[in-house]
């Protein structure tokens, strides 16, 4: 499957289906990842206007925050994006979905922070192992999107310096037990797994021991699979436009899709005086579609030159990927040129905008 251009493809995104209303879904994302929250309508069909809220404040769409009626994407997430997110019905403010999002450090490889937590001479004559950074070990459940890197750490000390070994689901865990292997960094008391997959789910236990004793800590890893979805169109685009007769107009449509999307621009038309067919589908004509030499960038813009009154009406940006369609529509209003307005005023006529 072609992934298309970087600006459109959201790398390492976890699409999280919305929990039942009333439930709060606890989610953990890595720094730099795309947080993607999904709140499908109860019936799979339209659910009316919605708003996304973070910590009680409505989210404003931006280059980084993509707000759709059923999905929210926060690109390149950072710690500041942690918080309580909810999708609400605009009119009633009823909470449809509720998520608790935490963005943590999830380095793309296990090599940063080297040197931290290394075995150190504590000055203690002899002693059983103990945790040197227990505050770094309080997150027992880690839920990460597939393809991310996971690092489990058990910083410890003791005299003599203890050894560390790892178990998965209670059994010895070695590199040959997973495709892609593992990195054991004894100096950092860590286990690193790159590009995690669903089969990596399970309980991981570090066992730290010396001749005076043994301590252990168990972490639970959940790997969130990416779920396919229809293209996401940026909220507010295309935007309604008002133009003067003879001027040029541009409609914009920003499409985000894992799979290469098809993009088309449609104009709504009337057939035998009707705007919709017998099944309620609007009658449309295709204005712009992918051609041999058309780039996706070009398809995201519809340009209308020297507009006439016939150009007024409803326009739709239609995007489709491997599993479905998404669309956003906007209206173009064409006003008479200023000279015509002046003449009309002198004649005592009134034009409705």
């Amino acid at each position: 499957e072609s992934l298309g251009t970087e600006q459109r493809v959201v790398g390492r995104a976890a699409e999280v289906p919305g929990p039942e209303p009333g439930q709060q879904e606890q989610l953990v994302f890595g720094s730099g990842d795309a947080v993607e929250l999904s709140c499908p309508p109860p019936g799979g069909g339209p659910m009316g206007p919605t708003v996304w809220v973070k910590d009680g404040t409505g989210l404003v769409p931006s280059e980084r925050v993509l707000v759709g009626p059923q999905r929210l994407q926060v690109l390149n997430a950072s710690h500041e994006d942690s918080g309580a997110y909810s999708c609400r019905q605009r009119l009633t403010q009823r909470v449809l979905c509720h998520f608790s999002v935490r963005v943590t450090d999830a380095p793309s490889s296990g090599d940063d922070e080297d040197g931290e937590d290394e075995a150190e001479d504590t000055g203690v004559d002899t002693g059983a192992p103990y945790w040197t950074r227990p505050e770094r070990m309080d997150k027992k459940l880690l839920a990460v999107p597939a393809a991310n890197t996971v690092r489990f750490r058990c910083p410890a000390a003791g005299n003599p310096t203890p050894s560390i070994s790892w178990l998965k689901n209670g059994r010895e865990f070695r590199g040959e037990h997973r495709i892609g292997g593992i990195k054991l960094r004894h100096q950092q008391w860590s286990l690193v797994m790159e590009s995690v997959v669903p089969s990596d789910r399970g309980n991981y236990t570090c066992v730290v021991e010396n001749k005076f004793g043994s301590i252990r800590q168990t972490y639970t890893l959940d790997v969130l699979e990416r779920s396919p979805h229809r293209p996401i169109l940026q909220a507010g685009l295309p935007a309604n436009q008002t133009a003067v007769l003879g001027s040029d107009v541009e409609f914009h449509c920003k499409v985000y899709s894992d799979a290469q999307p098809h993009i088309q621009w449609l104009k709504h038309v009337e057939v035998n005086g009707s705007k919709v067919g017998p099944d309620g589908t609007p009658y449309v004509t295709v204005l712009k579609t992918a051609g041999a030499n058309t780039t996706d960038k070009e398809l995201e813009v519809l340009s209308l030159h020297n507009v006439t009154f016939e150009d007024a009406g409803e326009y739709t940006c239609l995007a489709g990927n491997s599993i479905g369609f998404s669309h956003h529509s906007a209206w173009l209003v064409v006003l008479p040129a200023e000279e015509e307005l002046v003449e009309a005023d002198e004649a005592g006529s009134v034009y409705a905008g």
């Epitope: 088309q264 017998p278 099944d279 009658y283």
Partner: antibody, heavy 124, light 107 residues
């Protein structure tokens, strides 16, 4: 009332081809995705492939790749499924099914409307 | 391809019984799951989509639940017209795939 009406039963020889039609009445044909699903006698349902007329694109199941061709004629609101190199195990009822339209739920492969089925018998 | 596994493959029940059919996907499919009912010689009929949404015109005794990999179709009180074959179907991934079917027979 939107309907999908399929062509009649066919009896074919092994090695030959069959072309089944599916005409949509009472709807805006190109706005929907049309798929073909088959069911061998006493067996389950199997998706063969689908076409999205508005984009002019088709997808096929790996199993049928190279043997099946799905086309659509927007002027007559008709979809076609042609299966070549027929063998006895292709004996089945072939259904056309309508997936999501761009103004409905939008999922190409969520079928809410089916044709009545066309029995294709492959026998020497 | 995503494999859909239904259980049981057949069941016998009486009118008025509560019937549950389960479906498991070989990998997560979010809520992209539908249930179809098929009677002999007829085309399948959509009952449930988006895992739990009732298709219009379908009696409310049919309900669906689940998300991810495990899904359930429940018929709260079996009626004579409900004896049929039921298929689960995932539509969120190419190729879309059906379960092998569950035949609900009269006891």
């Amino acid at each position: 009332q939107v309907q999908l009406v399929q062509s009649g039963a066919e009896v074919k020889k092994p090695g030959s081809s069959v072309k089944v039609s599916c005409k949509a009445s009472g709807g805006t044909f190109s706005s929907y995705a049309i798929s073909w699903v088959r069911q061998a006698p006493g067996q389950g349902l199997e998706w063969m492939g689908g076409i999205i007329p508005i984009f002019g694109t088709a997808n096929y199941a790996q199993k049928f790749q190279g043997r099946v061709t799905i086309t659509a004629d927007e002027s007559t609101s008709t979809a076609y499924m042609e299966l070549s190199s027929l063998r006895s195990e292709d004996t089945a009822v072939y259904y056309c099914a309508r997936g999501g339209g761009w103004v409905s739920h939008g999922y190409y492969y969520l079928f809410d409307l089916w044709g009545q089925g066309t029995l294709v018998t492959v026998s020497s | 391809d995503i494999q859909m596994t239904q259980s049981p493959s057949s069941l016998s029940a009486s009118v008025g019984d509560r019937v549950t059919i389960t479906c498991r996907a070989s990998q997560g499919i979010s809520s992209y799951l539908a249930w179809y009912q098929q009677k002999p010689g007829k085309a399948p009929k959509l009952l449930i989509y988006a895992a739990s949404s009732l298709q219009s015109g379908v009696p409310s005794r049919f309900s669906g639940s689940g998300s991810g990999t495990d899904f359930t179709l429940t018929i709260s009180s079996l009626q004579p017209e409900d004896f049929a074959v039921y298929y689960c179907f995932q539509y969120g991934s190419i190729p879309p795939t059906f379960g092998q079917g569950t035949k609900v027979e009269i006891k």
